[in-house]
Amino acid sequence: GITSINCSGDMWVEPGEIFQMGMNVSIYCQEALKHCRPRNLYFYKNGFKEEFDITRINRTTARIWYKGFSEPHAYMHCTAECPGHFQETLICGKDISSGHPPDAPSNLTCVIYEYSGNMTCTWNTGKPTYIDTKYIVHVKSLETEEEQQYLASSYVKISTDSLQGSRKYLVWVQAVNSLGMENSQQLHVHLDDIVIPSASIISRAETTNDTVPKTIVYWKSKTMIEKVFCEMRYKTTTNQTWSVKEFDANFTYVQQSEFYLEPDSKYVFQVRCQETGKRNWQPWSSPFVHQTSQETGKRNWQPWSSPFVHQTSQTVSQVTAKSSHEPQKMEMLSATIFRGHPASGNHQDIG
């Protein structure tokens, strides 16, 4: 940009150097050159000479007018054609920007990843503003009324050390740029309700050599939370449809889950957990790939006919990936297919 130009005159922009995208804009150039009575004043945008909508106002001043200016940034400068000079003479230059006032931040979410020592808040910023936009996160104790503010760009991590005064907070985000300000909706946060258990990891899997082979998946977490509810999803690598099993887990020991799967197939497993009764899930664990062994005896394969797991399995459902490029985003394909015992299966968050 043109930030350190030595001007021989002035350049100014109406309505201002930063303006709302789509507005009509006038840019003025006023020369103050010594020993020059310019024949012409010229405007350049991003180095290219402009030909249209230029008005000579008087001997020293010209204006260029843009209808519905919609470029996020432009570098403007103007020059003078002085008699007796072979080259044009620079008068002045300006960086101009157009953009939008911010949208109100939406989908504000705050979580505490176990052992992180931080409350992490994220939000949707809305449509691009094209100009520098700041986010101010307000955290107000509902018990002491004390309010803290944090500057952020797209998320914020707030040390839980600074949240020791109380457990209940009101959190909201202000989006601010030179064209306006908008507030998110306020989020009521109870620190005890937003903890996400330490990451769950699938450590290994093995398929037994029995007449009806079974696959045992071993998985663990370092969480100290006693009551944890987990989902494991699995599918063949060639399939779009995930099956999902639900578990009540106790991570004082390694979890073992048994599956009766198709032989000689490559399966992908992922697991995620939440504190029982809470709403925030871990992200799905890294995909764990396991190849089942070849079928030994000849028999009709009925993958849904056998018991699924010796551990308390609540439900098995199927979900389908929306596209092979977005395996994390799932939607429910069918109702519960298998139910070991009554449960309040809840899948609105899958993916």
Epitope: T3, Q148, Q149, Y150, L151, V156, N177, S178
Partner: nanobody, 116 residues
Framework: QVQLQESGGGSVQAGGSLRLSCAAS????????MGWYRQAPGKERELVSM???????FYADSVKGRFTFSQENAKNTVYLQMNSLKPEDTAMYFC??????????WGQGTQVTVSS
């Protein structure tokens, strides 16, 4: 840690002017996003003006065209020029230093009272 000290408040008639100053000391000043805030009795603290980036300043709708934010880097000082003051501008005015991811630091504030 940056320390902030406001000055320039006082009592003025409606239509009058005041210029608030905020002097910053401490090594983190250069990384601050500086702002002016105000808090009227019984109300939440609100953002009045903030320096977003070079050549870009936010002004609350209620002060647009009347207040001007400026800074003097050599003196580590920011200013709020307040013209055409109204009774509803009466409040305690604070300057704040915000750095990414850190808690905003406030000055002690300076009182502005506008009488009709």
């Amino acid at each position: 840690q940056v320390q902030l000290q406001e000055s320039g408040g006082g009592s003025v008639q409606a239509g009058g002017s005041l210029r608030l100053s905020c002097a910053a000391s401490g090594y983190t000043y250069s990384s601050c996003t500086m702002g002016w805030y105000r808090q009227a009795p019984g109300k939440e603290r609100e953002l009045v003006s903030m320096l977003i980036s070079d050549g870009s300043t936010f002004y609350a709708d209620s002060v647009k065209g009347r207040f001007t934010f400026s800074q003097e880097n050599a003196k580590n000082t920011v200013y709020l020029q307040m013209n055409s003051l109204k009774p509803e501008d009466t409040a305690m005015y604070f300057c704040g230093c915000a750095t990414l991811g850190s808690r905003t630091v406030w000055g002690q504030g300076t009182q502005v009272t506008v009488s009709s």
